[in-house]
Structure formats: C-alpha cells, structure tokens
C-alpha cells in the first residue's frame, strides 16, 4: 500500500514593511514543531504594495483599504485556508510615518486608524499596525541577517552553508538604508557604547550580545536627496539648479512647496522668490560627493568618535551586510560583487554619473524615469555615507557585503520583528527535546 | 453634548434582514467612529462592527463578515446597521455607540438606547 | 482575538463594603482598556478608560488599575446604585472584545 503523506505541520507569519516610499508585505513559513531551532524561518513570499508609502494616504485615508486589497488577496491564496485564523498578521510602519507624526500625531494616528480597520477585515490574527522605532529597525535587521546567516546556531560546521558565511559564530553588522532612514548596526569590539540611547542587550540562545545600533531619520536616500536640493537652492541665483548628481542633459521642474513639505528640509527653508525651480544635471560625481558632504555635519562630537551630527559610532568591527536600497541601488549600478574594490566603485561612479541623460534612458528603457534619474546621486551617498559617514576605509571596503536575500530570505527587519513578537527567539539555547519557554528578547 | 437616538423595536422573520438606524443628536459624529455592539437577552456584549461616517470606512468582527453591513450618511448624522438572513440566535438588543478617538482609542463613551430585534417564525 | 476573561461571573457585597473585580486579556492590551456598568434595561455606561482614568461624571469611588494582561476594578464602598453588571473591554486590537460581565449583587 501506497504511504499517505500526512499533512504538513506548518506554521505561517505575515508581516508588511510599510516604508517611506512603499509597503511590502512578507509571508514567512516554518515547520510547527521546530520553532524555538534556528533558521528555520524562511520567506516563501514577497508582495509589493502597489502605489506609495502609506503616509501619502494622509489626505486621501479612504483610498488605504484598496490599495492594501491586491497584497492580503494573495495572502489569502497562498497561505491555507486552515490556516488562516492562526496566521499573525503584524503591520510595521518606519522613516516616513516618523515624519508624519513629527508633522501631526493626529493624522499620523488617523493613517494608523484605517491601516488597523482595513486589515481587521481579514481572517486572519491581526496583530496591530504601529511605528517602530529606529532603534527596533535597526535591532531586527540585525537579527534578521544574523539569524538567516546561522550565526546564533551554537553548532560550528566545518562547511558554509549560507553565501558571506566565514564559519565562525562573529555576527555580522547591518547597514539598512530605506528613504527616509538609514540604520547601522552592530556588535563592537570591547569597546564601551558611550552613549545608552545607542546601546542594546540581548541574550539570545544563550548567549548575550551588547549591541550599538543608530537610526539616522532624513538620511535615507529619499530625504537626503530633498535635503541636497533645499541646501543647494539656498545659494542658487535664479530658478536654474545646475545639480551635479544628476546625468547631463537632464531636466526636472521641482515646486518650492514639495521641497519644504517634509520636516527634514526645516532646517534650509527660506524664503525664495519663486514657487518653482529647474534642475538641470551636469554629471559630476566630485561636486556630487562634495555636496552630500554638506549634509553631515562632522564638526562636533561629544565623544570619543562619531559618525556624523554628534552621534557617537563605536570603531567599525567585523563583516557587514548592507541591504535594502544599498543593495538595490548597488544592484543595479552593477557594483555588489565582493571583487570591486572601493576605488573601483568610485571610478564607475565617475563614468556612470557623466553620462549623458539621453543615453542613460537609451541603455536602460525599461527603467522608470523618476527611478532611473536618481541613481547617480543614490550611489554617490551610498558612498559618501559609507565612507564619510560611517567611516568604512578603502580597505574595510571589503568588508561590507551587499546583500539582497540569504536562503531565499530577504535581509530587511521584518523576518526579525516577527521571529521577536511570535516568540521564536529563545534567550537560551533550545535542548533538543522542545521545552516550555517564557523569557524572550 | 452629542446623543444616540436609535430606531424602534423590530420583528423579523428567520431568513429576513433588518436595518437599525442610529441619529446623532446635539452634534455630528465628526470624525469619530461609530460602532455597533449586540447583546442577547441574558448575555453579555458582543461587538459587531465599527464605521468612521466621515470616510465610509467599515470593519467587521469575522462572525459577522458577510452578514453585516455597516453604512453611514453624513449629511444626516445617521449611521446604519443591516443584517441578513436572520436567525433566531440573532434576538437582542443592538446598541450603537461613539468611539472617543482614533487609533487605538475605541473606548465607547457615548452610547444609543438600543433596539431590539426578535427574530421569530 | 484577545479573549477577556472576568471574575467571578457573581459579587455579593453588602452595601458600603469594598467590592473588587478582575478582567485578564489573553495577551498584553498595555492600558487600552475600559470599564462599562450595565443596569437592568440601559446601555452600558463608560466608567473607566485607560485602564485608571474616570469618564467624566465618574464618582470617585470607582477606581481601575492594571496593565498589560491583568486589570481591576475596584468599588471603595458600595451604594445601592452601584448593583449591576460590570464589563470590561480591550481597545488595543480590532475586534474589540469584551469580558462576560461581573454582577454585583446585593447580599
């Protein structure tokens, strides 16, 4: 007689990135039985939300539950039936509902309201819409590339199981960069995390971590470009922006009300005597650099070191991933190979940002405009933030992985943020015999 | 002060609908939202649904998906609740009711005299 | 959903003593959570929100306190308009749930 496969004993997570720029929503599954092991969480989905970040919906809050509609009908498919009810349905919200509620906590809190109603509205467990903190983006990144990594498993194998994996139980830092945001994160060497804001203590699988973690809000690629343009306006003598982060030849109006729209442009808001400007690129990946520079303001810091704005950053130490929009912008620049050296990215950036608008949509006409217009000045910050920033050298280059899944996964805080409210992080180590568990990270 | 003054008593056959109907009086519901909670004779509170009128945004406990629907008219003041094919077990009083807030505030501070439905054959 | 547990289903105190009930969520609602009294043939009234604070019109008697799963309402000294049902209910999670109720009863 034939064996009758007995149905699987699985469990399922859903969790939606809502960013600056997009919502993402992420299906993770794993087997029931083994929750409490290492690694054994992986994503079997990714959606993305159609339309803009959810803090875009704040005039129009009406308009959240459809757009939302596309992304949870393919949860439903996918995830079964049965298991519906038992499915934890989380919602985190980063960089860009931070600003809105720096801007108005009652219509930060009125996008939140709808986001709740309109999920509620599906069977499964719905857990809550909320805003993370930085510091929480931050920590579950680094959770998330470190538990896909193996790097809590306490069993060292002789093998690498996973890519970047260097065979020993050293975790590796995160580098998260979003569009309103940018986390670094990670375990220093012996070295006394100066500042309590930036420090965190975990004792995952038995065995405690001291971790300094910093999220930089405006400094995502998005607001720092806007911050860019509020701060090269200033000194500009007509409604002409000659930018140099954008390719020759290119041109885009910009209104003066856009550009003050978000808190991170306060700071360069004057009054000037037009309501509109004109970018026109010129292609310089120097002045580009020098500009950005502007941004980070290296001339104060209460401590022994900092990164930039007088926020203290620990000595750099060990291997680093770098992912969300450092890998995608990097991605597509064609730079994410461990074999181009700091140097060599820089040279291609040189050649990449000189090129002339027109040939650039030529040689890449599948690509959105608005997308495609930015990476000259995405790559440059990544560069520049990495490099003066954080203080990544030609040589601890090398050490910086950029990184768009592990297994399948992607490298993002949301895998991390559901592995901490689902409690499958144990703060000891699982006996191989399942046990009850209640002290979690 | 705002109040709640809901729709009359009501007698419906099993398999019917019926629609309750709840006026603010002394005030708009502004941005607030309105829900709608039931109670069995004998029993305790059930929620069933909540609307913000001023968006027509409506969430459903999952026992009632389907079945309930919730609507509001702002220009009237006056949310609306409907229910179908009515059974026997759906016998109580229906009250609605102001939440106080936004997210995460659904406290209910201002509550309708309540209606009852019996649903008999 | 959270399930909101009330004990016991039944209080009887006689009038001016101290009357206390309980309501545990099945999962940390913080403080999103609120207190009703019900009489015979009224809607409930809000008698607490945010797990401490009084509606308005609130005699001081009535008092909350708890947070996270375990919540207390408790009467200082029971007049004889303070017999009737007690429920609490979490707003932190859609569905709003709500306990089964605590009759206080007149011994």
């Known amino acids: 007689t034939q064996n009758k496969a007995l149905p699987e004993n699985v469990k399922y997570g859903i969790v939606l990135d809502a960013g600056s720029s997009h919502t993402s929503l992420y299906i993770y599954k794993w087997p029931a039985e083994k929750e409490n092991d290492t690694g054994v969480v992986h994503q079997v989905e990714e959606c993305r939300v159609k339309g803009p970040g959810i803090s875009k919906f704040v005039q129009k809050v009406n308009e959240i539950g459809i757009y939302l509609t596309d992304c949870m009908e393919r949860a439903r498919e996918v995830i079964p039936r049965s298991q519906h009810q038992e499915t934890p349905v989380y919602l985190g919200a980063t960089a860009g509902m931070r600003l809105l509620r720096m801007e108005s906590e009652e219509l930060a809190d009125r996008v939140l309201d709808v986001v709740e109603r309109s999920l509620s509205n599906y069977p499964f467990d719905f857990q809550g819409a909320r805003i993370i903190t930085g510091q929480e983006e931050g920590a579950y990144g680094w959770i998330t590339i470190n538990y896909l990594l193996g790097k809590f498993s306490q069993k060292t194998r002789w093998f690498s199981i996973v890519p970047y994996e260097t065979n020993n139980q050293e975790t590796f830092g995160a580098l998260d960069l979003g569009g309103a945001s940018t986390q670094v994160t990670f375990v220093p060497q012996n070295q006394t995390i100066e500042s309590p804001d930036n420090a965190l203590q975990f004792r995952l699988y038995g065995k405690d971590y001291n971790v300094y973690t910093h999220s930089f809000l405006c400094y995502g690629k998005d607001q720092a470009l806007w911050q860019k343009l509020a701060k090269d306006i200033q000194v500009a003598s007509n409604e002409i922006l000659r930018d140099p982060c954008f390719h020759p030849g290119y041109k885009k109006v910009v209104n003066v009300s856009d550009l003050y729209k978000t808190p991170c442009t306060k700071r360069f808001e004057m009054t000037l005597p037009f309501q509109q400007f004109e970018i026109q690129g010129i292609g310089n990946y120097q002045q580009c650099h020098q500009s950005i520079l502007e941004l980070f303001n290296t001339s104060y810091c209460p401590y022994s070191q900092c990164a930039f704005n007088g926020i203290f950053l620990p000595p750099l130490q060990g291997d680093f991933g770098a992912f969300s929009a450092f890998y995608f912008v990097m991605k597509f620049l064609n730079l994410t190979s461990e074999k181009v050296s700091q140097e060599k990215v820089t040279e291609m950036m040189k050649k990449f940002c000189a090129q002339p608008w027109e040939e650039i949509k030529t040689s890449y006409a599948g690509v959105k405009e608005k997308y495609l217009s930015e990476y000259c000045f995405s790559g440059t910050y990544i560069l520049s933030l990495l490099l003066q920033g954080y203080h990544f050298t030609a040589d601890s280059w090398e050490h910086i992985h950029f990184i768009g899944k592990i297994q399948g996964s992607d490298a993002g805080w949301t895998l991390g943020y559901m592995l901490n409210l689902t409690n499958m992080i144990p703060a000891e180590q699982p006996l191989s015999t399942p046990l009850s568990h209640s002290t979690y990270v | 002060q705002v109040q709640l003054v809901q729709s009359g008593a009501e007698v419906k056959k099993p398999g019917s609908s019926v629609k309750v109907s709840c006026k603010a009086s002394?005030?708009?519901?502004?941005?607030?939202?309105i829900s709608w909670v039931r109670q069995a004779p004998g029993q305790g509170l059930e929620w069933m649904g909540s609307?913000?009128?001023?968006?027509?945004?409506?969430n459903y406990a999952q026992k009632f998906q389907g079945r309930v629907t919730i609507t509001a008219d702002e220009s009237t003041s006056t949310a609306y609740m409907e229910l179908s094919s009515l059974r026997s077990e759906d016998t109580a009083v229906y009250y609605c009711?102001?939440?106080?807030?936004?997210?995460?505030?659904?406290?209910?501070?201002?509550w309708g005299q309540g209606t009852m439905v019996t649903v008999s054959s | 959903e959270i399930v909101m547990t009330q004990s016991p289903a039944t209080l009887s105190v006689s009038p001016g003593e101290r009357a206390t009930l309980s309501c545990r969520a099945s999962?940390?609602?913080?403080?999103?959570l609120a207190w009703y009294q019900q009489k015979p043939g009224q809607a409930p009234r809000l008698l607490i929100y945010?797990?401490?604070t009084r509606a308005t019109g609130i005699p001081a008697r009535f008092s909350g306190s708890g947070s996270g799963t375990e919540f207390t309402l408790t009467i200082s000294s029971l007049q004889s308009e303070d017999f009737a049902v007690y429920y609490c209910q979490q707003y932190l999670l859609w569905p709003l749930t709500f306990g089964g109720g605590t009759k206080v009863e007149i011994k």
């Open positions: 002394g005030g708009t519901f502004g941005s607030y939202g």
């Open positions: 945010g797990a401490s």
């Open positions: 009711a102001r939440e106080s807030g936004t997210y995460r505030d659904h406290r209910l501070d201002v």
């Open positions: 609307i913000i009128p001023e968006f027509g945004i409506a």
């Open positions: 999962q940390s609602v913080g403080s999103n």
